[in-house]
């Protein structure tokens, strides 16, 4: 089936915004009023995965952008990037492990787990304006639960 | 050599669990996922859930509230049990494995175990 | 859910006949549509994924065709051993459906 995807923005749960640092990197930084416009809006595509009763396989790629977040090893270590692809072939309902989140709702709060590296989840530090990151823990300093919210396409 | 094996009482009374393990060799319960389908007798196939390499499980919803499936790796083990058995639920059960093949054939199910009869009477 | 319709529930045929057998998913499916045979009192087997791919093993006179909603499985000439019943199964997306199964038959 053609790939089903809808536009969204996303806040951590301390309400933190999410916007572009350069060409290749998100941060997380607190935004109000006008500046909310800076923030940026992700085409969440539903795609094939290793699905679930309680996960929901997405890959998250930047509203009329070539750039999709992605999860490789970077120095042995599990790594968040922003990877450029080719416009033609994406989105696609079977999109390479690399780009699949597993999008895990619990107390009206989402995670995004890394399908390539399990139980590893896109993070944002208490600090004001650092990257977003791969976490490898859940529940201590980093912040993994995001609010969604819904943009009319 | 892929093989898959499905072992259970083939008897089971009505309003008991009716519990089956898969054991498998060839391949590793880590890597791939592993699906129970079942077919009532001189019926068709229907799928009942499955089982991922993460552990991570989905079950197919009419029977999602009686159901847990299950896997121990190490034994290459995978179990499923289903609660509150009526007569409708007599049939032949069977395993098999993933494809797993991500980015392009995921969801399929390529080798399967011969399957075990159950039937659920008193 | 996806609902899949084969047809025809029953068929039977000669050996050295052609047959086809079809499946109509109820949304878009691609090409995620596989094709099982299965005789009595065994398992079944995958002999073809991904619409037309046949599966390693498999004999040249099966073939698959379909993109989307409709599918077509094909036995170019029938041989003793291919009188068994075949089912289709979606693999898009879960739950997985299977079609009804149709049962071919020595004529």
């Known amino acids: 089936a053609p790939v089903r995807s809808l536009n969204c923005t996303l806040r951590d749960s301390q309400q933190k915004s999410l916007v572009m640092s350069g060409p290749y990197e998100l941060k997380a930084l607190h935004l109000q009023g006008q500046d909310m416009e800076q923030q940026v809006v992700f085409s969440m595509s539903f795609v094939q995965g290793e699905e679930s009763n309680d996960k929901i396989p997405v890959a998250l790629g930047l509203k009329e952008k070539n750039l999709y977040l992605s999860c490789v090893l970077k120095d042995d270590k599990p790594t968040l990037q922003l990877e450029s692809v080719d416009p033609k072939n994406y989105p696609k309902k079977k999109m390479e492990k690399r780009f699949v989140f597993n999008k895990i709702e619990i107390n009206n709060k989402l995670e995004f787990e890394s399908a390539q590296f399990p139980n590893w989840y896109i993070s944002t530090s208490q600090a004001e304006n650092m990257p977003v990151f791969l976490g490898g823990t859940k529940g201590g300093q980093d912040i993994t639960d995001f609010t969604m919210q819904f943009v009319s396409s | 050599e892929v093989q898959l094996q499905e072992s259970g009482p083939g008897l089971v009374k009505p309003s008991e669990t009716l519990s089956l393990t898969c054991t498998v060799s060839?391949?590793?319960?880590?890597?791939?996922?592993v699906s129970w389908i079942r077919q009532p007798p001189g019926k068709g196939l229907e799928w009942i859930g499955l089982i991922w390499g993460s552990g991570d499980t989905y079950y197919n919803s009419p029977l999602k509230s009686r159901l847990t499936i299950s896997k121990d790796t190490s034994k290459s083990q995978v179990s499923l049990k289903l609660s509150s058995v009526t007569a409708a639920d007599t049939a032949v059960y069977y395993c098999a494995k993933q494809t797993n093949l991500w980015a392009y054939d995921l969801y399929s199910m390529d080798y399967w175990g011969q399957g075990t009869l159950v039937t659920v009477s008193s | 859910d996806i609902q899949m319709t084969q047809s025809p529930s029953s068929l039977s045929a000669s050996v050295g006949d052609r047959v086809t057998i079809t499946c109509q998913a109820s949304q878009d499916i691609d090409d995620d549509l596989n094709w099982y045979q299965q005789k009595p009192g065994k398992a079944p087997k995958l002999l073809i994924s991904?619409?037309?791919i046949l599966r390693p093993g498999v004999p040249s006179r099966f073939s698959g065709s379909g993109s989307g909603t409709d599918f077509t499985f094909t036995i170019s000439s029938l041989q003793p051993e291919d009188f068994a019943t075949y089912y289709c199964l979606q693999s898009d997306s879960f739950p997985l459906t299977f079609g009804q199964g149709t049962k071919l038959e020595i004529k």
């Open positions: 991904l619409a037309s």
């Open positions: 060839g391949f590793s319960l880590s890597d791939y996922g």
